[in-house]
Interface confidence: medium
């Protein structure tokens, strides 16, 4: 008995060939001997089967002795043994229809689980193997689960169902809803304007929800909500914003926030959350702000940074074009009785300068100038 695998919703063509290369009488029946279709001369006739409106044949092939049964919009319950009766012969074809669906929506939040469920006909014992867009293979039976979806899991998942040494392939497009970056850090000199950007790693027709940026300033004992906003069909509107600092927000995607001035009291870390309509859970992006200040008070030249710096970052004070006078893995460095000239305060990581602030030290009889 020939075995043919089909996919739910697809079209399958079951072949039946006569030894004579001409149009002769044929019938297709199911295992209950109910006629599906056949011919009456050059006319296609249909029987009382459940397939009535979905069954067809190719009249153009009859003259060549080929009498296919075409079943459109396959259903799992179409799985059956189909019998072609032609020239006093019976050809049997076993059709097995499978369906593979994602547990819920195919748009899932980062960190959520994806469950793929195989629909299969009774009596079948298929195995399933799926390959993610990043090449990760998972195997299973009726259900396959992937926990903690990552951004790289976005794309086409290719799943192969194996039954009776035959294969059928499914492709499922999965969109992982996430920000492009889980975390970002912005380095600014005191007084500079700060731009925070939160690009999304996906595109959808309509995007509706709400978001909030909670901020934990390094100097503050508790976090506070800096801004709450609404997202409606990719249009952003501010619902509520704290008075200090008075953030501004772009009206279009990507989500964009502007802090008018970087000040030591704002240095710290924030968590932007985005709740999307009809989705449980939220998208998160962490953002960090490091602020630098260089000052001269009497005979003391000081450079300080505030905010979440890693212990391996180096803070240095140097006179332009000279070796660093002081260099420490600390958040404040100073030089007593600095020479006159342009001093540079540098925050660096493995030799790469992340932030630089210049301060001009005048001869002792005048006051310092900060460019």
């Amino acid at each position: 008995k020939k075995v043919v695998l089909g996919k739910k919703g697809d079209t399958v063509e079951l072949t039946c060939t006569a030894s004579q290369k001409k149009s002769i009488q044929f019938h297709w029946k199911n295992s209950n001997q109910i006629k599906i279709l056949g011919n009456q001369g050059s006319f296609l006739t249909k029987g009382p089967s459940k397939l009535n409106d979905r069954a067809d044949s190719r009249r153009s092939l009859w003259d060549q002795g080929n009498f296919p049964l075409i079943i459109k919009n396959l259903k799992i319950e179409d799985s059956d043994t189909y019998i072609c009766e032609v020239e006093d012969q019976k050809e049997e074809v076993q059709l097995l229809v499978f369906g593979l669906t994602a547990n819920s929506d195919t748009h899932l939040l980062q960190g959520q689980s994806l469950t793929l469920t195989l629909e299969s006909p009774p009596g079948s014992s298929p195995s399933v193997q799926c390959r993610s867009p990043r090449g990760k293979n998972i195997q299973g039976g009726k259900t396959l689960s992937v926990s903690q979806l990552e951004l790289q899991d976005s794309g086409t998942w290719t799943c192969t169902v194996l039954q009776n040494q035959k294969k059928v392939e499914f492709k499922i497009d999965i969109v992982v809803l996430a920000f492009q970056k889980a975390s970002s850090i912005v380095y600014k000199k005191e007084g500079e304007q700060v731009e925070f950007s939160f690009p999304l790693a996906f595109t959808v027709e309509k995007l509706t929800g709400s978001g909030e940026l909670w901020w934990q300033a390094e100097r503050a004992s508790s976090s506070k909500s800096w801004i709450t906003f609404d997202l409606k069909n990719k249009e952003v509107s501010v619902k509520r914003v704290t008075q200090d600092p008075k953030l501004q927000m772009g009206k279009k995607l990507p989500l964009h926030l502007t802090l008018p001035q970087a000040l030591p009291q704002y240095a710290g870390s924030g968590n932007l959350t985005l709740a999307l309509e009809a989705k449980t859970g939220k998208l998160h992006q962490e953002v960090n702000l490091v602020v630098m200040r260089a000052t001269q008070l009497q005979k003391n030249l000081t450079c300080e940074v505030w905010g979440p710096t890693s212990p391996k970052l180096m803070l240095s004070l140097k006179l332009e074009n000279k070796e660093a006078k002081v260099s420490k893995r600390e958040k404040a460095v100073w030089v007593l009785n600095p020479e006159a000239g342009m001093w540079q305060c540098l925050l660096s990581d493995s030799g790469q300068v992340l932030l630089e602030s210049n301060i001009k030290v005048l001869p002792t009889w005048s006051t310092p100038v900060q460019p």
Epitope: T208, G209, S210, G211, E212, S221, S222, S223, K224, S225, T228, D230, K232, K239, R240, T242, Q243, D244, T273, A275, E277, A278
Partner: antibody, heavy 119, light 107 residues
């Protein structure tokens, strides 16, 4: 555990004044907007006023504007509602509530304080 | 001000029934809608925000849907502790406004 406890309710004559207090605990009070909501006997809920985290933004329902004042003391984790020129229609149970989450819902409520305005 | 209209004003039901309460806003409020449950002599209890986000600890038999002007609260299988009054509330613009309430009572 978030707790909100109202006090200061009682019987007052029309035209009189009353000050309600709400003591908050179990969360960082200075990080949240707070609201007052009232419920007249046998009636539904009516939002009265709210105040932002540091107390410099305040909003009121039209029926109490100019008569009621919402305020807060973050150092004492306390919310207040000063009610002047009270009318019979102000008779209600007054609830203090925290506005939490990005959908600005009233996620925690006090048990309420009854204010009766009657001569 | 945005008017919130709930229907029905009361519903008689039995344990195990599916109960649906609707709330209509006089103008579009996106998803800025919350649902609360209140029992006699008690403070309201927060159930749902953002029209459909269930507050943690609230049983999954409660669900919310809708956006714009039309919203629904559904209790899939009514339990004895669910007999109460339910209110919707908009947080789209000041003043916040509540629906008049829907009382779910024993049939």
């Amino acid at each position: 555990e978030v707790q909100l406890v109202e006090s200061g309710g009682g019987l007052v004559q029309p035209g009189g004044s009353l000050r309600l207090s709400c003591a908050a605990s179990g969360f960082t009070f200075s990080s949240y907007w707070m609201s007052w909501v009232r419920q007249a006997p046998g009636k539904g809920l009516e939002w009265v006023a709210n105040i932002n985290e540091d107390g410099n933004e305040k909003y009121y329902v039209d029926s109490v504007k100019g008569r009621f004042t919402i305020s807060r003391d973050n150092a004492k984790n306390s919310l207040f509602l000063q009610m002047n020129s009270l009318r019979a229609e102000d008779t209600a149970v007054y609830f203090c509530a925290r506005e939490g989450g990005q959908w600005l819902a009233l996620d925690h409520w006090g048990q309420g304080a009854l204010v009766t305005v009657s001569s | 001000d945005i008017q919130m209209t709930q229907s029905p004003s009361s519903v008689s039901a039995s344990v195990g029934d599916r109960v649906t309460i609707t709330c209509r806003a006089s103008q579009g409020i996106s998803s800025w809608l919350a649902w609360y449950q209140q029992k006699p002599g008690k403070a309201p209890k927060f159930l749902i925000s953002g029209a459909s986000s269930l507050q943690s600890g609230v049983p999954s038999r409660f669900s919310g849907s809708g956006s714009g002007t039309d919203f629904t609260l559904t209790i899939s299988s009514l339990q004895p502790e669910d007999f109460a009054t339910y209110y919707c509330q908009q947080a789209n613009s000041f003043p916040w406004t509540f629906g008049q309430g829907t009382k779910v009572e024993f049939k």
